[in-house]
Amino acid sequence: ATKLTEEKYELKEGQTLDVKCDYTLEKFASSQKAWQIIRDGEMPKTLACTERPSKNSHPVQVGRIILEDYHDHGLLRVRMVNLQVEDSGLYQCVIYQPPKEPHMLFDRIRLVVTKGFSGTPGSNENSTQNVYKIPPTTTKALCPLYTSPRTVTQAPPKSTADVSTPDSEINLTNVTDIIRVPVFN
């Protein structure tokens, strides 16, 4: 099995977590994708998901979470805006592929949100809300109720591990400021 790894993000209240989950394999492009939190000893809980089938470059918003699926680049962009201390935890992206179990995309993300602002010039505490206004065209999608217990303790099978970066360059011409997509490295 592929070893599960975590990437740690330490942010302050009010800031934005902005990450991507890469799925690379084209067969997953239109599959429904979800953002989950994993609490100790519990099943992963789905917080937001894309539509089914997942639409290309179409923001889906659930509360403070915005998902954008970029089929042409094999990535799901996840943003959690206006972070709160209680958002701290372990997160993961999964691809729903019923009737099979959800396909987990590594690496997991360990989010640590602390109180207060750093006050450092150039930091994003004051600008976060302005830069990341919620897109006016967002959609709320219904998420499947099932969650695989396998994703709690096990890595995906080796055959499904090809989920790395689609190191691609996105044409930003027809994309608004809030939907620019980080896709490299």
Epitope: E7, V163, S164, T165, F184
Partner: antibody
């Protein structure tokens, strides 16, 4: 332990060709995109090319487009850079690099580099 | 292409000094910025990713901040081993690096 080892550098005349290799170990090579980054003597870092895990996303810097070809062999845990029509300005240390994880912005793992000198 | 402008290009400082390096992007890159340290003859070493996340094993005297177009790398108390060249790198589109900042001994 993640290790990246480049080879294939050397002295070549302008217009010549060279093939660089990067041998990867210590991680599931087939699960990660890979990059080539170069650094001319006394200059800064310049990204050259990237290839996704299954080779279906490939990108090049404008300065090398049409002359360089990136490829990989997941069965051999190897990354390659075929460099044709070499110019003096391609003289640099070439690094292969891998980012830390699936969501990070940073290139965490680097090889030791291999020097390519293009000179007549 | 997205340009990254680092300043200053060089700085002379003493052990114990607080050093601040800035990186300005030509367009909004959210938090998709990394900082590296490079010593002569060596490969770059990742210090900070996602603008403010400290890479594991990197001393806490290094910190990063910023979002959008303006970013900062701060070394709170310069140590002898910190004299090196520092680069910023964006990954919104294909990667580009800043021109580098050389931190020299005063």
């Amino acid at each position: 332990e993640v290790q990246l080892v480049e080879s294939g550098g050397g002295l070549v005349k302008p217009g010549g060709s060279l093939r660089l290799s990067c041998a990867a170990s210590g991680f599931t090579f087939s699960s990660y995109s890979m990059n080539w980054v170069r650094q001319a003597p006394g200059k800064g870092l310049e990204w050259v090319s990237s290839i996704s895990s299954s080779s279906n996303y490939i990108y090049y810097a404008d300065s090398v487009k049409g002359r360089f070809t990136i490829s990989r062999d997941n069965a051999k845990n190897s990354l390659y850079l075929q460099m044709n029509s070499l110019r003096a300005e391609d003289t640099a240390v070439y690094y292969c690099a891998r980012r830390g994880g699936s969501s990070s912005t940073g290139l965490l793992y680097w090889g030791q580099g291999t020097l390519v000198t293009v000179s007549s | 292409d997205i340009q990254l402008t680092q300043s200053p290009s060089s700085v002379s400082a003493s052990v114990g000094d607080r050093v601040t390096i800035t990186c300005r992007a030509s367009q909004d890159i959210s938090s998709w910025l990394a900082w590296y340290q490079q010593k002569p003859g060596k490969a770059p070493k990742l210090l900070i990713y996602a603008a403010s996340s400290l890479q594991s094993g990197v001393p806490s005297r290094f910190s990063g901040s910023g979002s959008g177009t303006d970013f900062t790398l701060t070394i709170s108390s310069l140590q002898p081993e910190d004299f090196a060249t520092y680069y910023c790198q964006q990954s919104l589109t294909h990667p580009t690096f800043g021109g580098g900042t050389k931190v020299e001994i005063k």
